[in-house]
């Protein structure tokens, strides 16, 4: 029949789960630049992957348009809080698209972890969660920011991360 | 034509939502055991199933290769706080694999809930979820840890849960 | 061959992602009630979408039946808390089935946030993230609620919101 | 075998000062907080305030704030309340007890109680 | 603060016999299933006894004659059967909110 090509295409992407765009990127000792920039991500060791979509400067940039379920986790800690700090973390995800200058706010949370110091100690952890669908065009990014960054616990890139798949 | 049989698998698998491999497991009476372990969980009744994934012992197990979406939530809670108790509470995935001895970090939260009690009352709550994209291999395992795990309040299976679905 | 209709149309899904299901709906000034209902969400503009779902008075109905991953977060705030609040504020989705005259709990948090303000400020924010996989058959719905619902933050449907998509 | 072992009965005039002591031992010192009560002659328990023995942070029922000061020593498992401008109205037992998370906050173990009596 | 409601403040039951106890608390003092009760057990010169936790746990080495139950606002203390040694009196504490507050004590005397 004439369906060959295709037909091979088509069991071959069944197979492979279709390649659906996937990412996981991990929190690394470079992610935080103080730059008042986006977090940057490591995208090949350890638990870091790409599959069918591109990383540049700390943003995943879809290759293939669509809806796509985007996460993050952020790790905060600390012992007290800086001072001036307000009382507000943000952690959000944005979207970079050529065809407007600004980031797009997509999902975005704050809260004030500072006054979760236990009775044992100034010592405090919180921890923050996005995840949603949202619809990229191909060549349109998204970036992790946090403010403040100084508040960002790293280790071994587990605790915080970003990542995304297609829906 | 020749693709016959195989047609007529992608057309099923295709009305089947491809069988994709997903799952979502419950908090039940059973899942503290107090003995260091992981948490174990409901996998039939009520809003608890598996489809495409196995399960053992606490963990779900990946019976075809392929990134996976796996996400764990759980309802902490207390009157007070033990002393003794780091001012953490670690929630968090962790993998199993033939290929090396011990569990391996995927995904973790650390936490400090117990500063948290409003004006007079010591109750407090707090929940703490996860979720990233993981690459398991056939076999390979995924467990739930909470250290301290006195502090998960267990209910009827909305507020701690544990589940996968692949991307 | 006799399969040129279904050829086209699994090719067809193919290039479309399958149609599969999908929806991000965002918080609006008219989610929050005050009537003991859900919230409620906007559908269209900005970030918002519904594909292969619809949307009644608050809920996500599901036009297919299958394992859908349902999310939503929502932004808690407030200066101090309201008196006579108890410490707990619960943030669940819920289902609604012809076959069931009551709500069904689904994926539930409870949080006491209002202890959370840092020692300069009585302000306080905190976020509340459920996601999980449930079953839906067609034209059962999922809504969102919160109580104390006085304390979620709309803004610009960034840090409130809910959705889902087949899995 | 856990001990809370209290310091002996006080004689003090009224305007002075008096600190108890309790001793501890039998169990990690660090590990539960310590909790002070007052039992007035023939009457009931008043629950006074606690200390965190691991940094010393005191929480104090609010009638008994500008009362009592307390204070731990890590070295030596001891716990100790300060008692300050003393009136016949702080005559009483003072007892302190060991606070038990994993049984609801409740008092398990219980020091055999110091006498304080204030008199001119 | 949370007013612990004690009565009988005094009873006198037989040997062998049940002793009730009953303990109202002004509001609930309950947390996810537990009720956050405590009951104790005083001797004239002596410190008070541990004898329930959590509104219905047995602390180690209390005799099972002794129980207890309630949940909410309302709990009672249970001895039964009634020995010699019982005789004492017993507080109820909620341990659920500051301050930690007591019944004003109910004296159980034997027959």
């Known amino acids: 029949d004439g369906h060959g090509g295709s037909w091979e295409q088509l069991i071959q992407e069944r197979r492979s789960h279709q390649n659906n765009p996937a990412a996981h990127l991990t929190g690394a000792n470079s992610s935080l630049t103080g730059s008042g920039g986006p977090l940057l991500w490591e995208t090949q060791l350890g638990l870091a992957f790409l599959r069918g979509l591109d990383y540049h400067d700390g943003a995943l940039v879809a290759n293939k348009a669509g809806y796509y379920y985007i996460y993050s986790k952020v790790q905060l800690g600390g012992v007290g809080c800086p001072l001036g700090l307000a009382s507000t973390i943000t952690h959000g995800l944005y979207k970079r698209t050529p065809r407007y200058p600004e980031e797009l706010e997509l999902l975005v949370s704050q809260q004030s972890p500072c006054g979760r110091a236990t009775s044992n100690s100034r010592v405090w952890w919180d921890s923050s969660f996005l995840g949603g669908v949202v619809h990229l065009e191909v060549g349109e990014e998204v970036v992790v920011r946090v403010l403040d960054e100084r508040l960002v616990r790293l280790r071994d890139g587990t605790r915080s991360y970003f990542g995304a798949f297609m829906v | 034509d020749g693709h016959g049989g195989s047609w007529e698998q992608l057309i099923q698998e295709r009305r089947s939502h491809q069988n994709n491999p997903a799952a979502h497991l419950t908090g039940a009476n059973s899942s503290l055991t107090g003995s260091g372990g992981p948490l174990l969980w409901e996998t039939q009744l009520g809003l608890a199933f598996l489809r495409g994934l196995d399960y053992h012992d606490g963990a779900l197990v990946a019976n075809k290769a392929g990134y996976y979406y796996i996400y764990s939530k759980v309802q902490l809670g207390g009157v007070g706080c033990p002393l003794g108790l780091a001012s953490t509470i670690t929630h968090g995935l962790y993998k199993r694999t033939p290929r090396y001895p011990e569990e391996l970090e995927l995904l973790v939260s650390q936490q400090s809930p117990c500063g948290r009690a409003t004006s007079n009352s010591r109750v407090w709550w707090d929940s703490s979820f996860l979720g990233g994209v993981v690459h398991l291999e056939v076999g390979e395992e995924v467990v739930v840890r909470v250290l301290d795990e006195r502090l998960v309040r267990l209910r009827d299976g909305t507020r701690s849960y544990f589940g996968a679905f692949m991307v | 061959d006799g399969h040129g209709g279904s050829w086209e149309q699994l090719i067809q899904e193919r290039r479309s992602h399958q149609n599969n299901p999908a929806a991000h709906l965002t918080g609006a000034n008219s989610s929050l009630t005050g009537s003991g209902g859900p919230l409620l969400w906007e559908t269209q503009l900005g970030l918002a979408f519904l594909r292969g779902l619809d949307y009644h008075d608050g809920a996500l109905v599901a036009n297919k039946a299958g394992y859908y991953y349902i999310y939503s977060k929502v932004q808690l705030g407030g200066v101090g808390c309201p008196l006579g609040l108890a410490s707990t504020i619960t943030h669940g989705l819920y289902k609604r089935t012809p076959r069931y005259p009551e709500e069904l709990e689904l994926l539930v948090s409870q949080q006491s946030p209002c202890g959370r303000a840092t020692s300069n400020s009585r302000v306080w924010w905190d976020s509340s993230f459920l996601g999980g996989v449930v079953h839906l058959e067609v034209g059962e719905e999922v809504v969102v609620r919160v109580l104390d619902e006085r304390l979620v933050r709309l803004r610009d449907g960034t840090r409130s919101y809910f959705g889902a998509f087949m899995v | 075998e856990v001990k809370l072992e209290e310091s002996g009965a006080e004689l003090v005039k009224p305007g002075a000062s008096v600190r108890l002591s309790c001793k501890t031992s039998g169990y990690t010192f660090t590990n539960y907080y310590v909790y002070w009560v007052k039992q007035r002659p023939g009457q009931g328990l008043e629950w006074i305030g606690e200390?965190?023995?691991?940094?010393?942070?005191?929480n104090f029922n609010e009638k008994f704030k500008s009362k009592a000061t307390l204070t731990v020593d890590k070295s030596s498992s001891t716990a100790y309340m300060h008692l300050s401008s003393l009136t016949s109205e702080d005559s009483a037992v003072y007892y302190c007890t060991r606070s038990n998370w994993d049984y609801g906050n409740a008092m398990d173990f219980w020091g055999q109680g110091t006498s304080v009596t204030v008199s001119s | 603060d949370i007013v612990m409601t004690q009565s009988p403040a005094s009873l006198a039951v037989s040997l062998g016999q049940r002793a009730t106890i009953s303990c109202k608390a002004s509001?609930?003092?309950?947390?996810?299933?537990?009720?956050?009760m405590n009951w104790y057990q005083q001797k004239p010169g002596q410190p008070p006894k541990l004898l329930i936790y959590?509104?219905?746990h047995l602390d180690s080495g209390i005799p099972a004659r002794f129980s207890a139950s309630g949940s909410g606002t309302d709990f009672t203390l249970n001895i039964h059967p009634v020995e010699e040694e019982d005789a004492a009196t017993y507080y109820c504490q909620q341990s659920i909110e500051d301050p930690f507050t007591f019944g004003s004590g109910t004296k159980l005397e034997i027959k």
């Open positions: 200390i965190n023995p691991t940094n010393g942070d005191p």
């Open positions: 959590k509104a219905s």
């Open positions: 509001q609930s003092v309950d947390f996810d299933g537990d009720g956050y």
